[in-house]
């Protein structure tokens, strides 16, 4: 067995078991778990005479280590005396010593419960000019206790003469009051009621409660866009902190990975908002493979004025996967807008909700600012859908009348993209095999009852336009309806709202 130092324990009797007329009393010291022999036990008895006896070491069966007990018998005025047992084990090291100081007997005691109670706010929920803190020290075996109030860990100069003690049965209770100015209380300091009793310290602490997200500050952590992840293959995640009050302290945004592996170098941007608050963003490049394999990334926000750090974490969305269905449509010509058309793209039934939408013309991706795409919304089933809207000019469709709506999504195969082409004038341009449009018909949202369409944005459709079933010769999904103009002999009426 290797060298092992002893653990040392004092051995005392219960005070109530020692007769009041006892002329002598014995206490002991146990040294156990050491190897090899020997240990040296000595006693410091102060001014009292005592006799000591160290018992022969015994072997602990399981470990092969040793244990020994040294006994001290004292007589006379021992009651309040403290004794020190000193154990040395030179095999551990020449200066290995453990001291235990204790009294002849141990008193059974019930430790106190310490609780701080706080005065209420006024009726309007505001703090009054002074705040009272009441420290309740309850349920302890009667004995000497000392109460101290601390402010941020420093002893306060408080008049403790107001502390009052009561006894109920065999247990005692004490209370102490501290009065604070509103200014002190609102300064966000921590106040502690510290009680010393039977050689132990008991505390409770309190402070003005912070909001769950301190001072209205919010932090958000985004996932990488499917476009960055699968097409550009340079995914990033962004930690966004908003509603910070500009101050001298620095906002720290720290990145970490759940795996403990190192993170890449992040870029940081600070922006002063019109309302005077500060917005801080930190963008972290992540490994494509790390993200796909499910690594969790954490952003930790600290600031001297925040009572606690804000933590946000992000990882790949779990759950079922479903590839998006993509449908592209062109709106018919609108009176007075002959040189502009709106193209619409419905992307639906995909899971999870992370999706990137792009529009292409002439095999070139159009800038994101050109199109407007809704946030993913849940379908009636378990998937999600988005609409994307693109305005095109006559010059563009006359140059080449084919526009492509492309969805980038992790469940799309083979290359995480699904796309559909759409033409402004399918008859002239020959259209696209991927998506055709019924002439003079306008897409209606699915799920509506037969009858008048529901106007989008409050516009009222022509009274003779209604939601009818899609024609068999129009290759749209069966759950989509089309608006049909039923009047004969009139100029076709088209309505672009959703049913």
């Amino acid at each position: 067995a290797s060298t092992q130092s002893p653990s040392v324990f004092p051995l005392t009797r219960c005070c109530k078991n020692i007769p009041s007329n006892a002329t002598s009393v014995t206490l002991g010291c146990l040294a156990t778990g050491y190897f090899p022999e020997p240990v040296m036990v000595t006693w410091d008895t102060g001014s009292l005479n005592g006799t000591t006896m160290t018992l022969p070491a015994t072997t602990l069966t399981l470990s092969g280590h040793y244990a020994t007990i040294s006994l001290l018998t004292v007589s006379g005025a021992w009651a309040k005396q403290m004794f020190t047992c000193r154990v040395a084990h030179t095999p551990s090291s020449t200066d290995w010593v453990d001291n235990k100081t204790f009294s002849v007997c141990s008193r059974d005691f019930t430790p106190p419960t310490v609780k701080i109670l706080q005065s209420s706010c006024d009726g309007g929920g505001h703090f009054p000019p002074t705040i009272q803190l009441l420290c309740l020290v309850s349920g302890y075996t009667p004995g000497t206790i000392n109460i101290t109030w601390l402010e941020d860990g420093q002893v306060m100069d408080v008049d403790l003469s107001t502390a009052s003690t009561t006894q109920e049965g065999e247990l005692a209770s004490t209370q102490s009051e501290l009065t604070l100015s509103q200014k002190h209380w609102l300064s966000d300091r921590t106040y502690t009621c510290q009680v010393t009793y039977q050689g132990h310290t008991f505390e409770d602490s309190t402070k003005k409660c912070a909001d769950s997200n301190p001072r209205g500050v919010s932090a958000y952590l985004s996932r990488p866009s499917p476009f960055d992840l699968f097409i550009r293959k340079s995914p990033t995640i962004t930690c966004l902190v908003v509603d910070l009050a500009p101050s001298k302290g620095t906002v720290n945004l720290t990145w970490s990975r759940a795996s403990g592996k190192p993170v890449n170098h992040s870029t940081r941007k600070e922006e002063k908002q019109r309302n005077g608050t500060l917005t801080v963003t930190s963008t972290l490049p992540v490994g494509t493979r790390d993200w796909i394999e499910g690594e969790t990334y954490q952003c930790r926000v600290t600031h001297p004025h925040l009572p606690r750090a804000l933590m946000r974490s992000t990882t790949k969305t779990s759950g079922p996967r479903a590839a998006p269905e993509v449908y592209a449509f062109a709106t018919p010509e609108w009176p007075g807008s002959r040189d502009k058309r709106t193209l619409a793209c419905l992307i639906q039934n995909f899971m999870p909700e992370d999706i990137s939408v792009q529009w292409l013309h002439n095999e070139v991706q159009l800038p994101d600012a050109r199109h407007s795409t809704t946030q993913p919304r849940k379908t009636k089933g378990s998937g999600f859908f988005v609409f994307s809207r693109l305005e095109v000019t006559r010059a563009e469709w006359e140059q080449k009348d084919e526009f492509i709506c492309r969805a980038v999504h992790e469940a799309a195969s083979p290359s995480q993209t699904v796309q559909r082409a759409v033409s402004v004038n399918p008859g002239l341009a020959g259209g696209s095999a991927q998506s055709q449009r019924a002439p003079d018909r306008v897409l209606c949202h699915s799920g509506q009852q037969q009858g008048l369409p529901r106007a989008a944005g409050g516009s009222v459709p022509h009274p003779r336009c209604h939601c009818g079933a899609g024609r068999a010769d129009w290759p749209g999904p069966p759950e989509l309806d089309v608006c049909v103009e039923e009047a004969e002999g009139e100029a076709p009426w088209t309505w672009t709202g959703l049913c």
Epitope: D152, T201, F202
Partner: nanobody, 126 residues
Framework: DVQLQESGGGLVQAGGSLRLSCAVS??????MGWFRQPPGKEREFVAA????????YYADSVKGRFTISSDNAKSTVYLQMNSLKPEDAAVYFC?????????????????????WGQGTQVTVTS
């Protein structure tokens, strides 16, 4: 997800120093403790701190040599270990508690703490 992550352990000569860190994430705590488990022995108390008042408590065997401290802004607790002895060699664990009240009476008890780290090895050679 609550995590307590110890670091700073290693090999040191007797008489040398080490500083252990315990980084906390996922929750805010009111008190922290350090415990150690020497080879072939039970886990034992080393030091504890109230994160509210800054009050500290130490095992007799480390008093005067070890110092526990905290940096609340970084959610980290430290154990500065000086004058290390061979008997200080152990796996050191940090532990955390959310109870608002704190006392030396309970701080040394393992049952006081609901959250524990995985431990960091400290080896002291003579």
């Amino acid at each position: 997800d609550v995590q307590l992550q110890e670091s700073g352990g290693g090999l040191v000569q007797a008489g040398g120093s080490l500083r252990l860190s315990c980084a906390v994430s996922g929750l805010s705590f009111s008190s922290m403790g350090w415990f150690r488990q020497p080879p072939g022995k039970e886990r034992e108390f080393v030091a504890a701190i109230s994160l509210y008042s800054g009050s500290t408590y130490y095992a007799d065997s480390v008093k005067g040599r070890f110092t526990i401290s905290s940096d609340n802004a970084k959610s980290t607790v430290y154990l500065q270990m000086n004058s290390l002895k061979p008997e200080d060699a152990a796996v050191y664990f940090c532990a955390a508690d959310r109870q608002r009240t704190w006392s030396t009476f309970y701080a040394s008890r393992q049952a006081t703490y609901n959250y524990w780290g995985q431990g960091t090895q400290v080896t002291v050679t003579s």
